[in-house]
Structures are given as C-alpha cells and as structure tokens.
C-alpha cells in the first residue's frame, strides 16, 4: 500500500486501521473534491474494484462493509466518478491490518553458553498475530530490584557484563501489539545455575584388533567446569533405537569411552553434557559416524559397553529416535577403512 497519499477528502476505518481478525469492518470514504459532484464513489481493495455492500450515505460520503474481515493486510482506496472526467479521481487510501492480540509468551528459558559472555533467553510466541508485535524482556534483580528491559523479536542475548550487580534475577517477557498485551510467567534465574558447558566434540574413534574387538571413542570439551555429567548416545545407522550411556566427566584430559559393538557395522555417536546437578543440557554434538571392523571369528555379538577408567558409568538405556530427546538433523557421514586398519570416522563442527 501507499503510506503517504495526497487525499482530496478522507478515509477512515471502524473499528480502526488495525483490528481483530474476523471482525466486521466499515470503511468510510468522504470526498472533498473541488469542481466535482461525484456521480459515484468507488472502493478498491488491493487494486481491485469492490462491487458489494457499498452504501452511499450522502452526497460526499460512502461506506463499504466487510463481514468477518480476515485478511492480514489490505490496501484500500476510494475514487470518485466526476461528470466530464474520463478517469476516476482518487479521493484517499489507507493500509488496513487485521490480526490477533499476542498470546502470553510460554516456555521461557534462559541459558549462558560458557565463554559466550551472554545470557540467551528464548520463548514460544504462541499463535501468529499477523501484525507488528514486539517482545520486551524484563530482567529484574531479586537483590537490588533494579530492572532492565530489552526489545526483542523472538529471542534475546543479554551481555553478562550488564548483569554484574547480582546473581539472582526474575526474567519475564511482555508481548505487546496494537490489540493487546500479555506477560509470560516470571522465571527465577540464578546465573550460576544456567551455564551450559562449552561444546563437547567427538574427535575420533578406533576399533582395536583384539580377540574381542572394542571401539574407543575419544571426546573432549574446552569447559572449565569441574563437575560435568554427560550422555553419549549411539546406534547403528540402520537402527531407530538409541542406546544411551551416562558418564561423570573431567575434561582436564580427553575422555575415552569403550564400547563392545557389532562388527562390520556403521555406528552413529553423539554426546551432550551439563553441569552436574543443573538442568540445562548442551545440544547433542554433531553426528559422528564410525565403521567397526569386520568379524574375524564366529560368535554371537551382544552390544554392550564398558567405561574407561576415568569415567563412572551409571546406566545404559535404550531410547528410540522418536523419543523425548530433541529431534536431531541426522547427517550421515562416511567412514572408510584403509588396508584393514582401524577406521576413524568423520565429524562435522
């Protein structure tokens, strides 16, 4: 639509230029043309002439009525048919919008990715509003009562430098548009409790040539957090079900985890960690694919695993791909075997 137009009259909208989707809407056109007593007043929506529900109120004014208007945006203009003029004469135009008041933002989560220097907060915005909606993130110290506000669209990154005065905060999100305002629940945040350790990466894997071949997976993180709890999940590329192993990790050295796996199979490994006792997990690491060696003797293989000496294994559980774990974009990467030597898989950052 045209936002600025030289009007020879006026156009107005009831209940207003921004209104709730599905409402009945009346649009009025009032001409103030010099040297014209219009025979007819016409309405156009998005450039197309309207035919129905037009009422001529008096000599200068007409109205068009829409029942249950449900288009998010439309450009309306009206024209006059002046005697002696070949073309219609423009009177005025207006952009109109319909939408919804915002839902209360939900599932507000704030985390600090280690070394990022930011607290990142995300939330669900709810159903589409179709109109300009802003989100204001409020961060209020539980100790000083000082409050800071940040304008956002779908998430916010707040420098931890601006959170120096306190460790405990209340965070909430206010959603505002022309049709309403809603608040999220208030989230009680302790900065020390929301740190997610620096990314964990599986660097390589090898399968030994022992009588009972074992696969050693090497993985690391640059985290400075001392007590870290991790999960490694693994499955064959043909399987839907993940096995999950849990570890207490100490990243002062590279972690090594031993697995007894089916021979001649392509396995996918992923790892994720959290600070021990805290609730926020890293996302799963990039899929790491490893091909186990070919079977040398006949035996029944049972996939099982044994932790390396540096780690404490709590449980091994089975999880199907369609489980509560967040969905992963599984990009399968090739692994090659060179002259029968143990194969290293590829990984992506």
């Amino acid at each position: 639509g045209i936002t600025s137009i030289n009007c020879s009259g006026d156009m107005w909208v009831e209940p207003g230029e921004i209104f709730q989707m599905g409402m009945n809407v009346s649009i009025y056109c009032q001409e103030a043309l010099k040297h014209c007593r219009p025979r007819n007043l016409y309405f156009y929506k998005n450039g197309f002439k309207e035919e129905f529900d037009i009422t001529r109120i008096n000599r200068t004014t007409a109205r068009i009525w829409y029942k249950g208007f449900s288009e998010p945006h439309a450009y309306m203009h009206c024209t006059a048919e002046c005697p002696g003029h070949f073309q219609e004469t423009l009177i005025c135009g207006k952009d109109i919008s319909s939408g919804h008041p915002p839902d209360a933002p939900s599932n507000l989560t704030c985390v600090i990715y280690e070394y990022s220097g930011n607290m990142t907060c995300t939330w669900n915005t709810g159903k589409p509003t179709y109109i300009d909606t802003k989100y204001i993130v409020h961060v209020k110290s539980l100790e000083t009562e000082e409050e800071q506000q940040y304008l956002a669209s779908s998430y916010v990154k707040i420098s931890t430098d601006s959170l120096q005065g306190s460790r405990k905060y209340l965070v909430w999100v206010q959603a505002v548009n022309s049709l309403g305002m809603e608040n999220s629940q208030q989230l009680h945040v302790h900065l020390d409790d929301i740190v997610i350790p620096s990314a964990s990466i599986i660097s390589r894997a090898e399968t030994t040539n022992d009588t009972v071949p074992k696969t050693i997976v090497y993985w690391k993180s640059k985290t400075m957090i001392e007590k870290v709890f991790c999960e490694m999940r693994y499955k064959t590329t043909t399987n839907q079900t993940w096995s999950v192993k849990e570890f207490d990790a100490n990243f002062t050295y590279v972690q090594q985890s031993e697995f007894y796996l089916e021979p001649d199979s392509k396995y996918v490994f992923q790892v994720r960690c959290q600070e021990t006792g805290k609730r926020n997990w890293q996302p799963w690491s990039s899929p790491f694919v490893h091909q186990t060696s070919q079977e040398t003797g006949k035996r029944n293989w049972q996939p099982w695993s044994s932790p390396f000496v540096h780690q404490t294994s709590q449980t091994v559980s089975q999880v199907t791909a369609k489980s509560s774990h967040e969905p992963q974009k599984m990009e399968m990467l090739s692994a090659t075997i060179f002259r029968g030597h143990p194969a290293s898989g590829n990984h992506q950052d």
Partner: antibody
Framework: EVQLVESGGGLVQPGGSLRLSCAAS?????????MCWVRQAPGKGLEWIGC?????????YYANWAKGRFTISRDNSKNTVYLQMNSLRAEDTAVYYC????????????WGQGTLVTVSS | IQMTQSPSSLSASVGDRVTITCQAS??????LAWYQQKPGKAPKLLIY???KLAAGVPSRFSGSGSGTDFTLTISSLQPEDFATYYC??????????????FGQGTKLTVLG
C-alpha cells in the same frame, strides 16, 4: 538529591482535558529509570495511575482504569514527564503526585509536592 | 495483582508494639514497599524489598515476609508515628489488569 516539582493542576470542567508536568532534577536521564504518577482523592488512599520506563527504549504502563484516558510521556531535553488527562470526570478530583527513585526500581524514594486537580462545573 | 491491607484503622498508645499486614493476591517475591503519610504531605518511603530500611528511617520500623504475606512492625510507637501507612507491590507493572499497586491504607490513631 532528586527533586520533583509538579505543575499544571487547577479547575477543569467535566469532559475537559489537562496536562500535568513533573520537572525532575538530580536524575541521570541517560540511565534506566521509572517515573510514575500516583493520585489521592480527598480523604482516600493512594491510587496508582501509571509509569514510564526510560532505558534503551521507552515503555509505559497504566492501571486498567486509566487506559485510554490518561497518557504518560516525557521530554528528555526538559527533564520533564507529563500526564495527559482527557475526558475528565468529577471522580478524577485528587492531588496528583509524580514519584521515582531515580532508577529502575518501582518503589519511590522521592515524591513531588503534589498538584490539585478539581473537576467541577 | 491485588493488595489487601489490614486492619484499615488501628488505635494504639505511645510505646505500643504495632503490626500491620499486607497480602498480595499472587507471589510478589520480596518486592514490597511500605510508606508513611501524614495529612497534607506526600508519602514517605519506610521499607523496600520487604525488609530493607530506607535511609533516615528509625530502626523501630521493620518489615518482614515474602511471597504473598507481609508485615510492617513498629516496635515502640512514638508520637510522630501516628499517620496512615500503605503497602505497595513493586514486582511488575506490565500486567494488563492491574487496578492499584497500593494497599488501601491503615490509619493509625492515638488510643483514647
């Protein structure tokens, strides 16, 4: 020390409008702060009208009874906050106070002296 | 959020210990302030963050509570303490349905 001085009160007819001013000194107008308006009808309690938050952006909040009729704004160059009151009624007769702590907290260390608004024909 | 203060009026004597309560309709953590107001004057901040004494306020005033229930206590009433007292929630004002952030007030008068 923060000082607040209200002005603009007086007698107004029902249906009329009035703009109150609150001139502030001693506030760091480049920092985050809340400035609020509170009123008190004769012999009644304190009634919150609304607040303006000034920081990296400006945000306003109103009591639900004040929405639509009352508008809070500010002029940073004059260190002044305004309360625009429209469609005034007899029950809007009150002493109007501006209040702040000079920072982004919502309790009020500093209050103006108040300005009386009388709505009567 | 609604703030309910009680009692609405209270008579006491100099030297008495006096307690005024304020209840919030939902959790406001420790975000509560107390004010004293004398006739013809602007209110004066006594307590903020539920229990912190404002500058220059005598130590006979104290505040306690968190969540929804709060108390203002004057340990030993002095003649200058006879006034009206208000509580105020200072949690958040971005709620679309706030009617008033103040309690209705407690008028403290001299007994007899």
């Amino acid at each position: 020390e923060v000082q607040l001085v209200e002005s603009g009160g007086g007698l107004v007819q029902p249906g009329g409008s009035l703009r109150l001013s609150c001139a502030a000194s001693g506030i760091d107008f480049n920092s985050n702060y809340y400035m609020c308006w509170v009123r008190q009808a004769p012999g009644k309690g304190l009634e919150w009208i609304g607040c303006i938050y000034v920081g990296s952006h400006v945000n306003t909040y109103y009591a639900n009874w004040a929405k639509g009729r009352f508008t809070i704004s500010r002029d940073n160059s004059k260190n002044t906050v305004y309360l625009q009151m429209n469609s005034l009624r007899a029950e809007d007769t009150a002493v109007y106070y501006c209040a702040t702590s000079g920072s982004s907290v919502l309790y009020f260390k500093f209050w103006g002296q108040g300005t009386l608004v009388t709505v009567s024909s | 959020i609604q703030m309910t203060q009680s009692p609405s009026s209270l008579s006491a004597s100099v030297g008495d210990r006096v307690t005024i309560t304020c209840q919030a309709s939902e959790n406001i953590y420790s975000f509560l302030a107390w004010y004293q107001q004398k006739p013809g004057k602007a209110p004066k901040l006594l307590i903020y963050s539920a229990s912190k004494l404002a500058a220059g306020v005598p130590s006979r005033f104290s505040g306690s509570g968190s969540g929804t229930d709060f108390t203002l206590t004057i340990s030993s009433l002095q003649p200058e303490d006879f006034a009206t007292y208000y509580c105020q929630q200072t949690n958040r004002y971005s709620n679309p349905d706030i009617y008033n952030v103040f309690g209705q007030g407690t008028k403290l008068t001299v007994l007899g």
